[in-house]
Amino acid sequence: ATKLTEEKYELKEGQTLDVKCDYTLEKFASSQKAWQIIRDGEMPKTLACTERPSKNSHPVQVGRIILEDYHDHGLLRVRMVNLQVEDSGLYQCVIYQPPKEPHMLFDRIRLVVTKGFSGTPGSNENSTQNVYKIPPTTTKALCPLYTSPRTVTQAPPKSTADVSTPDSEINLTNVTDIIRVPVFN
């Protein structure tokens, strides 16, 4: 059975989470991808998604979340800028493949954000605003309204075939939550 594993990232407030999700490019290059948060006992909640079909190297920003899908490499890059303590949580990357349930990518990310930015002298990342200037063409993509018939328990699923799907609620104007991404598939 496929075991779902977690990777932990411990970062400070104001820093940027930067993870890459690896997918099979022949199968999923143009598929819509999403970044989700998983809360205990709840359906995964979609925080941001790429366009449909997903555009190559085209940044999509939802709040502090930036998604970039690199078709040639089979990689979805997920960044969450200006992290807040409240962003701490469990995240995952999924690929939408209607009418089937979304395909989850490994691993889940356990994000732990603590108070106090600890940049070092000479660091050019003390101001996230200056580092990540999102192009004016950045779009906000509407995410599919998926609801899984399966219930979500606190125990992670045992195989990708049993992975729960994202829920249907996403507020694009108020997504300042968390970000997290799994990687290689």
């Epitope: 411990e10 930067d18 997918y23 990342e125 290689f184 598939n185």
Partner: antibody, heavy 119, light 108 residues
């Protein structure tokens, strides 16, 4: 427990070929990228090549591009590195390494296999 | 290609003392940095990733910090088993993924 074990190293003449293999266990092999990293005697670490979990994407260092080929067999949980047109500068311990699930760093390493290119 | 520069090349420290190792990237890599430990005749072992996060099983005397271009690995109280060579590695996005040249921590 995650384990990776390399084999196939040895002595080869300049211009010759060698095939390294890596057997992996303890994790869902096809869910993770795998890499080869080498270390010349007394020197530092040098990334050589990476292949995605599905095998659909491969990356190579400029120093080996066109001469080395990385491949994987997900049904057997094995990773290979076919090395052609070998040079003295390719002499090194070659490590098989599992790539992390969220970024391009290496969370588990094999013990390494020594490749010596000499006449 | 991003160039990673480690300093010092060799650090002489007495057991129980604090060791501070530096790693500098030629361009900003956010917190996309890992640290590895390598003992003679052994494979490298992952210590820290994401600049701050300790890998599984790594003692809390090891800590990482920094972002952008300047990074630090601190060993708060050196134990005999900590004398080794330490490498940093960037993983910001595309290959080549580069390592620093290493810092050897030796017994003073």
């Amino acid at each position: 427990e995650v384990q990776v074990l390399e084999s196939g190293g040895g002595l080869v003449q300049p211009g010759g070929s060698l095939r390294l293999s890596c057997a992996a266990s303890g994790f869902t092999f096809n869910a993770y990228a795998m890499s080869w990293v080498r270390q010349a005697p007394g020197k530092g670490l040098e990334w050589v090549s990476t292949i995605s979990g599905s095998g659909s994407t491969t990356y190579y260092a400029d120093s080996v591009k066109g001469r080395f080929t990385i491949s994987r067999d997900n049904s057997k949980n094995t990773l290979d590195l076919q090395m052609n047109s070998l040079r003295a500068a390719d002499t090194a311990v070659y490590y098989c390494a599992k790539v992390a699930g969220s970024n391009f760093f290496f969370d588990h390493w094999g013990q390494g296999t020594l490749v010596t290119v000499s006449s | 290609e991003i160039v990673m520069t480690q300093s010092p090349a060799t650090l002489s420290v007495s057991p129980g003392e604090r060791a501070t190792l530096s790693c500098r990237a030629s361009q900003s890599i956010n917190v996309n940095l890992a640290w590895y430990q390598q003992k003679p005749g052994q494979a490298p072992r992952l210590l820290i990733y994401g600049a701050y996060t300790r890998a599984t099983g790594i003692p809390d005397r090891f800590s990482g910090s920094g972002s952008g271009t300047e990074f630090t690995l601190t060993i708060s109280s050196l134990q005999s088993e900590d004398f080794a060579v330490y490498y940093c590695q960037e993983f910001i996005m595309w290959p080549p993924w580069t390592f620093g040249q290493g810092t050897k921590v030796e017994i003073k």
